[in-house]
């Protein structure tokens, strides 16, 4: 299953499959997730070790048993790959690291006014993988405001150094934010020239293209089909690059197929997995396990559930079958691709779906061992769970926010439905940033069911929580995916990095905002909050957030939207925007419904009709 917990001051001993430099544990975890054999990782922050060569070291590990012995190491951080973690699987990494220089091949230098502009330049450059920016206070005047675009053979820095007034980060191409655009065309009977960066075996050009997309240095590819004249080169997928970023030449060649990486696509990237099943094909590799199952789909599910399994072959040979069940060969290799592909067999083969980010049709939870006033504009994909609840009352308008918590579930505030309980007047927009982008043709979700908490009463602040079941499930993308819920009665976690988002008013007597706003607000203890609201009862099922001096808060139109907090690199839905005295007033914090206190209710209501829990537990 999916394991998300991080282990502080712990280092996994042995099992090394690769090592690299990464700026933090979260990036190390992402590299582990996308490495074909990595199940566990250990990361050494700069503060944890004196050995300069091992600072920022990220160690990717494998284990036949799925675990390794942990040794105590002050400052080290260890954890699990996010394979099998559904929507949490993403190669997108937005963080900017202050006081850190990520080294690599510097291939472009320009003057820019901000680190965000530098990151944008990197994202819009086909070869840029990461960057460093020297701020205006950098010690050498001639380097100030320099934006260095970089790459390396492995896509990660060749070294990371602590350096004042330097900020570094990664390209946002894996976030589907590149302005370059991509070539979707597949070119039949055409071979590209240039430098081969890797060679793998794939059953078709589409798998080859997906592997190219997620390979750090692949810009285009050539695939040799299973009828290519040279037998030893059949099904070979050559991942390629060039200085210019495009093929320098192409040659007409029978039984070859060429194409481009889709990493530069805007708004949609292919999933990092291959779901197609190939009948009459055997995939060769190292044997992991053999099991008898009924049907090729069950074989694929079995492979997906066994975390080390990368691909499988389901044999229909009479000697491999008994009654209705046949042998399912679960296999793996060093690079995640078959070591041999045979055609005209009585088998069917395919890949594990462990890296598919659609996950199951569920709500995401975690286990643990009203515009925003004073906010700023959000960017694409920053809060992919945020939805806009709109009503079509001839004129259409945004009324509330909400949070996507599963393919078919949105969590919001009950008071959003005061006076508007009719489900067919509501339209739910997900994956949007600007309300002005919504036109008559913009797709929206309709409501199948509104589930208001049974103890909620109109005009009272208690139990202000409601679930919306959508008529049709949503697909997950970088711009539309769920937020994880906290564990039941989560009281031990101290959240220090919390944000409220919404399109609500920017002042008490304001108007709905066009661009989704975000504001960083600290949580306030319930005791402190109660002092500020002596006429109301602040219950343990509420959570408050705000600054003593005011100035930053949720406001009208933000209701129902998320209060999210980042903990151990993972965002969780801590609160639902509910009520407050005015907006952003001094010593009047915002009051939010505390989601952890309603986990039993959420779980009960999101049970599917067949009684199967719709919950996904990353831990």
């Amino acid at each position: 299953g999916c394991l998300t917990q991080l282990y502080e001051n712990a280092f996994f001993r042995g099992g090394d499959v690769a090592s690299m430099y990464t700026p933090n544990a979260q990036y190390c975890q992402m590299r582990c997730t996308f490495h074909p054999r990595c199940l566990l990782f250990s990361f050494l922050p700069a503060s944890s070790i004196n050995d300069m060569e091992k600072r920022f070291g990220c160690f990717l590990k494998d284990s036949v048993t799925g675990t390794l012995p942990k040794v105590h190491r002050t400052g080290a951080v260890s954890g699990h790959s996010l394979k099998q973690c559904g929507h949490q699987i993403s190669a997108c990494h937005r963080d900017i690291y202050k006081g850190v220089d990520m080294r690599g091949v510097n291939f472009n230098v320009s003057k820019v006014s901000s680190v965000e502009e530098c990151q944008k330049r990197c994202t819009s450059n086909i070869r840029c993988q990461f960057f460093s920016y020297a701020t205006q206070t950098f010690h050498k005047a001639e380097y100030r405001n320099n934006c260095l675009l970089k790459y390396s053979p492995g896509g990660t820095p060749t070294a990371i150094k602590v350096l004042s007034n330097v900020e570094s980060g990664f390209s946002l191409k894996p976030c589907a934010l590149s302005e370059i655009g991509c070539h979707m065309n597949i070119f039949q009977h055409l071979a590209f020239s240039d430098v081969d960066v890797a060679r793998v075996l794939t059953p078709d050009a589409f798998v080859c293209r997906t592997i190219c997309t997620y390979h750090p240095n692949c810009l285009f590819f050539t695939f040799y089909t299973n009828v290519w004249k040279i037998e030893s080169q059949r099904n070979v997928c050559l991942l390629k690059t060039s200085e210019s970023g495009t093929p320098s030449s192409s040659t007409p060649q029978e039984n070859t197929i060429s194409g481009y990486s889709l990493l530069t696509c805007k708004r949609t990237l292919p999933e990092p997995c291959h779901s197609k099943i190939y009948p009459g094909v055997d995939f060769g590799g190292e044997e992991l396990n053999v099991t008898f199952v009924k049907g090729v789909n069950v074989c694929q599910e079995t492979c997906t559930k066994m975390i080390r399994c990368q691909f499988f072959t389901y044999s229909l040979l009479p000697e491999d079958c008994k009654e209705e069940k046949c042998k399912c060969f679960l296999r793996l290799s060093m690079d995640g691709s078959p070591t041999r592909i045979a055609y005209g067999t009585q088998g069917s083969s395919g890949y594990s779906l462990r890296l598919c980010n659609t996950g199951d049709n569920s709500v995401c939870t975690t286990k643990t061992s009203t515009r925003i006033v004073g906010g700023t504009n959000s960017s694409w994909g920053e809060w992919p769970w945020q939805v806009s609840l709109q009503v079509k009352l001839t004129a259409q308008r945004h009324l509330c926010g909400g949070s996507l918590i599963g393919h078919q579930w949105v969590l919001t505030a009950a008071h959003c439905f005061d006076g508007l309980p009719l489900q067919d007047v509501w339209r739910i927009y997900s994956g949007i940033l600007n309300l002005s982008d919504i036109t008559k043709d913009t797709p929206f979700s309709q409501i199948k069911e509104i589930i208001i908490h049974q103890n909620y009463k109109v005009s009272e602040g208690n139990h202000d929580i409601a679930l919306i079941k959508l008529q049709a499930p949503l697909n997950y993308t970088e711009f539309q995916k769920p937020i994880c819920l906290p564990s039941k009665g989560d009281t031990s976690t101290i959240y220090t990095n919390c944000w409220v988002t919404g399109w609500g008013f920017s002042k008490e007597k304001g108007e709905i905002q066009n661009i989704l706003q975000k504001v960083n607000i600290p949580l306030v203890t319930n005791e402190e909050c109660q002092k500020r609201y002596q006429d109301y009862k602040i219950t343990q099922r509420m959570v408050c957030a705000g600054y003593k001096e005011g100035g930053k808060d949720a406001c009208k139109g933000d209701s129902g939207g998320p209060l999210v907090c980042k903990h151990n690199g993972m965002w969780r839905l801590v609160g639902i925007t509910s009520w407050g005295e005015g907006c952003a007033r001094r010593e009047q914090p915002g009051v939010y419904t505390k989601v952890a206190e309603y986990m039993d209710w959420i779980l009960e209501k999101t049970q599917s009709s067949d009684g199967k829990a719709q919950m996904q537990s990353p831990a």
Partner: antibody
Framework: QITLKESGPGILQPSQTLSLTCSFS??????????VSWIRQSSGKGLEWLAH???????RYNPSLKSRLTISKDTSRDQVFLKITSVDTADTATYYC?????????????WGQGTLVTVSA | DIKMTQSPSSMSASPGERVTITCKAS??????LSWFQQKSGKFPKTLIY???RLVDGVASRFSGSGSGQDYSLTISSLDYEDMGIYYC?????????FGAGTKLELK
């Protein structure tokens, strides 16, 4: 039970300002989704929608008359008002205030009985 | 503005007869259409909303259908009291616009 009742001056002269009041009961204009429209009916132009006001004070007007129309409300007194400036004989009509079906704006569920306004020199 | 073309402008029918009135919008109105009846000297009475939903208390002989640009009101078995003028109105977008009306008379 939901009722709406229009009141107006009956007769007025060209270039004057027409002031209409809609007094209603059985619902509140502070309820989310609620709204009230003004519609008029004349023998020459048939039925014509004039303006709509929502619970949150959002206002919509017929573009062909927008410069002359002002819709407003007094939520505490359960009243909606319409002002039409610079009237002429073409504004002679029966004026209705209407409320949507149920909670949502779904056609006109409830009509007032109408008030006849005659513009005459 | 969305133009609503209603037909016929007038018609005669006998009690018990099936009567259909149509309304065509100049663009797709997503079923945001209402039908109402007005008897001589009286204020209008809504029959149908959202193209096919019957208002509570309205006789079941009235029904609405249609989608996109084309809509119709059907009276399955005409009654004496059904005489009057029938109008359609679109409320997909402002300004709301009406059909010119269909005058239904007894044969």
């Amino acid at each position: 039970q939901i009722t709406l009742k229009e009141s107006g001056p009956g007769i007025l002269q060209p270039s004057q300002t027409l002031s209409l009041t809609c007094s209603f009961s059985g619902f509140s204009l502070s309820t989310s989704g609620m709204g009230v429209s003004w519609i008029r009916q004349s023998s020459g132009k048939g039925l014509e929608w004039l303006a709509h006001i929502y619970w949150d004070d959002d206002k919509r007007y017929n573009p062909s008359l927008k410069s002359r129309l002002t819709i407003s409300k007094d939520t505490s007194r359960d009243q909606v008002f319409l002002k039409i400036t610079s009237v002429d004989t073409a504004d002679t009509a029966t004026y209705y205030c209407v409320r949507p079906h149920y909670y949502a704006f779904d056609g006109f569920g409830y009509w007032g009985q109408g008030t006849l306004v005659t513009v005459s020199a | 503005d969305i133009k609503m073309t209603q037909s016929p402008s007038s018609m005669s029918a006998s009690p018990g007869e099936r009567v259909t009135i149509t309304c065509k919008a100049s663009q797709d109105i997503n079923s945001y259409l209402s039908w109402f009846q007005q008897k001589s000297g009286k204020f209008p009475k809504t029959l149908i909303y959202r193209a096919n939903r019957l208002v509570d208390g309205v006789a079941s002989r009235f029904s609405g259908s249609g989608s996109g640009q084309d809509y119709s009101l059907t009276i399955s078995s005409l009654d004496y009291e059904d005489m009057g003028i029938y109008y359609c109105v679109q409320y997909d977008e402002f300004p709301l616009t009406f059909g010119a009306g269909t005058k239904l008379e007894l044969k």
